[in-house]
């Protein structure tokens, strides 16, 4: 028991040696930095951890084992001392007692000593077994952590190489970005130059436009003057013709019949030999009141008096009863000829009405009514239509029987509402009905889903606002 050594072997394991009489006990313990804690027992098939556990637990565990070993050693030494003391006492007694008792006493003492030694040996064997168990466990843990460390080292190496790659890529991209920035700056400069050039060009164009506008104004004035001159010339020619017809009536009566000073409609203008499209002055028989109307001398044989035209939204059609009565707008552009004139004209002889329509997709259609007339103002210029043909719907988009004319200040429709106010413009509204060619003018891409647009239901449906419309009349027998 008196020989106890602690040393390190060649492979770095702690060596404990206990001398017990002729027996010598040697314990080889691994030099461990990390042991599994007692609270988490070792499981042989457990999944290996990616990272080792904290090392402190293992160190503490080893220290506990060392303390146990030292305690056991001290205990054994105490036992040895105690046995020696007992042996001394017993030797003295033996010497004092009679020789005959010596053998028996010796046997008894020997037996006691053997029993005690056997008991200690058993305890020591248990401790040894425990230590070996723990050692095996620690060795397995060490192996596991060693593997985990290797795996981590490999991962670190992989990550390091990955980082290096990314750094290379990053520097490459940085170079590329710098190059692109340079390119971008150059492009921006060229764009700026182009912009400056364009601005110069725009200012030039603006000045040109201003000049052109001035020229247009001048031309318009000149045109008006020319039209007046033409009108005066026409009157002079008509006067001359009248004078000639009066002086020559006996010689050639047909000349007097063929020439007229005024025309009631474009059919008469056409028949008089004027076959060019344009604005003409019309006068009703037995009337001095003149109206300017556009005559279409080409479409369907010519002679058409245009009573309404929509083409660009340049004229406001949300007008009063009086304005719709006498007419408004520009006869060579958007206009309304006038309900009074049309009413009087269509009540003198039978007229046909042709309505020509254009949509925003380049399509055209028409509705032709073989008989058309308007009632007098007393009957609110009620529309009368018969005999529909054409491509703009098999059903009439002007309600049948005809309705009274309504304007924003004269509500003659069949709706609780005021259709003219709801849908804008003057029209022969029902409640409010399938058409309104005097509605709001909407440009392309804004012309759908409109309550108050230029509508011809049986061609384009309820929400579609048309691009262009022309309403024209001509005597039925033309």
């Amino acid at each position: 028991y008196n020989n106890f050594r602690k040393s390190m072997d060649s492979i770095g394991k702690k060596q404990y040696q206990v001398q017990h009489g002729s027996c010598s006990y040697t314990f080889l313990l691994p030099e461990m930095d990390n042991c599994r804690s007692s609270s988490s027992p070792y499981v042989s098939n457990a999944v290996q951890r990616d990272a080792p556990l904290e090392y402190d637990d293992s160190v503490q565990r080893l220290q506990v084992l060392e303390n146990i070993m030292e305690n056991n050693t001290q205990w054994l030494m105490k036992l040895e001392n105690y046995i020696q003391d007992n042996m001394k006492k017993e030797m003295v007694e033996i010497q004092q007692n009679a020789v005959q008792n010596q053998t028996a006493v010796m046997i008894e003492i020997g037996t006691n000593l053997l029993n005690q030694t056997a008991e200690q040996t058993r305890k020591l064997t248990d401790v040894e077994a425990q230590v070996l168990n723990q050692t095996t466990r620690l060795e397995l843990q060490l192996l596991e952590h060693s593997l985990s460390t290797n795996k981590l080292e490999k991962q670190i190496l992989d990550q390091t190489s990955e980082i290096n790659k990314l750094q290379d890529k990053n520097s490459f991209l940085e170079k590329k970005v710098l190059a692109m920035e340079d390119k971008h700056i150059i492009q921006l400069q060229s764009i700026k130059e182009e912009k400056d050039q364009l601005q110069v060009l725009v200012s030039k164009q603006n000045s040109i436009i201003e000049e052109l506008e001035k020229k247009i104004v001048t031309a318009t004035v000149n045109n008006s003057v020319l039209q007046k001159q033409q009108h005066d010339l026409m009157e002079t020619v008509n006067n001359l013709l009248t004078m000639m017809s009066t002086s020559n009536s006996a010689k050639d009566p047909t000349v007097a019949k063929g020439e007229q000073i005024s025309f009631r409609d474009c059919a008469e203008v056409f028949k008089s030999g004027h076959t060019t499209n344009g604005v003409y002055t019309l006068t009703l028989p037995n009337s001095t009141e003149e109206v300017k109307a556009y005559c279409d001398m080409e479409a369907g044989g010519g002679g058409w008096t245009i009573i309404q035209r929509r083409e660009d939204g340049s004229v406001d059609f949300q007008r009063t009863w009086k304005e719709y009565k006498v007419g408004f707008g520009n006869p060579s552009g958007e206009y309304w000829l006038g309900n009074e004139f049309v009413s009087q004209l269509t009540n003198q002889q039978r007229y046909v009405l042709k309505i020509h329509l254009k949509d925003w997709e380049g399509n055209e259609a028409y509705s032709l009514y073989e008989h058309f007339y308007l009632s007098s103002e007393e009957l609110n210029y009620r529309i009368h239509l018969k005999g529909l043909t054409g491509t703009a719907g098999k059903i009439s988009s002007i309600s049948q029987p005809g309705n009274d004319f309504s304007t924003k200040d004269a509500d003659n429709d069949k709706c609780i509402c005021k259709c003219s106010q709801m849908l804008t413009g003057g029209w022969w509204f029902d409640a409010c009905g399938p058409s309104n060619l005097n509605g709001m003018y909407y440009p392309q891409r804004q012309n759908t889903n409109k309550f108050n647009g230029i509508k011809w239901y049986y061609w384009k449906g309820s929400g579609y606002s048309l691009k262009g419309t022309t309403m024209m009349i001509r005597p039925a027998g033309f």
């Epitope: 609780i416 399938p434 889903n449 509508k455 309820s462 929400g463």
Partner: antibody
Framework: QVQLVQSGAEVKKPGSSVKVSCKAS????????MVWVRQAPGQCLEWMGY????????GYNQKFEGRVTITADESTSTAYMELSSLRSEDTAVYYC??????????????WGQGTLVTVSS | DIVMTQSPDSLAVSLGERATINCKAS??????VAWYQQKPGQPPKLLIY???TRDTGVPDRFSGSGSGTDFTLTISSLQAEDVAVYYC?????????FGCGTKVEIK
Amino acid sequence: QVQLVQSGAEVKKPGSSVKVSCKASGYSFTDYNMVWVRQAPGQCLEWMGYIDPYNGGTGYNQKFEGRVTITADESTSTAYMELSSLRSEDTAVYYCARTRDRYDVWYFDVWGQGTLVTVSS
Amino acid sequence: DIVMTQSPDSLAVSLGERATINCKASQDVYIAVAWYQQKPGQPPKLLIYWASTRDTGVPDRFSGSGSGTDFTLTISSLQAEDVAVYYCHQYSSYPPTFGCGTKVEIK
């Protein structure tokens, strides 16, 4: 009597489409426009669009443009509303309704019973 | 789009008393306004159109008024069966739009 009967409730996944039907009876199907209105939980009523069964003309609320398609089958007097690219916000009760006037999309005098469409992943 | 703002959001009125619901349009809608009644689990029902015209079969205790931007629905003598949500609707321009509703309850 005038009646609009809609198809049953639907549960749909986000990104999919739903097609709701509305069968009309008791009146001439082509004489009136048909509209679709939806009502999301705790939200206002929202007009989606209309169809004119007479000529197939349609009009849509710009909010749904490109996602909603309204069609009509004159032979069965049925209108359909298909909504695509569904998202959770499309969870709502969808109603079909008849307009009082053929020529204009005025007020709505007859309504279907509604179809609940739930959009959930 | 035209915004229709209803007020109040909810209204508690005693039986037989007058209930008044207001609706304000963000722009002039003339008289193109309708009112609907919606009871739980049911579709809306047309009550008034053209701001003041009662639909067929609607009791005369319901009346509508207004033009331009301000409109009112009045229930002159509230009945138990009038408990519902009421919506205003403009159809003056596309897209037609609705108010968000006024809940009418009995006090």
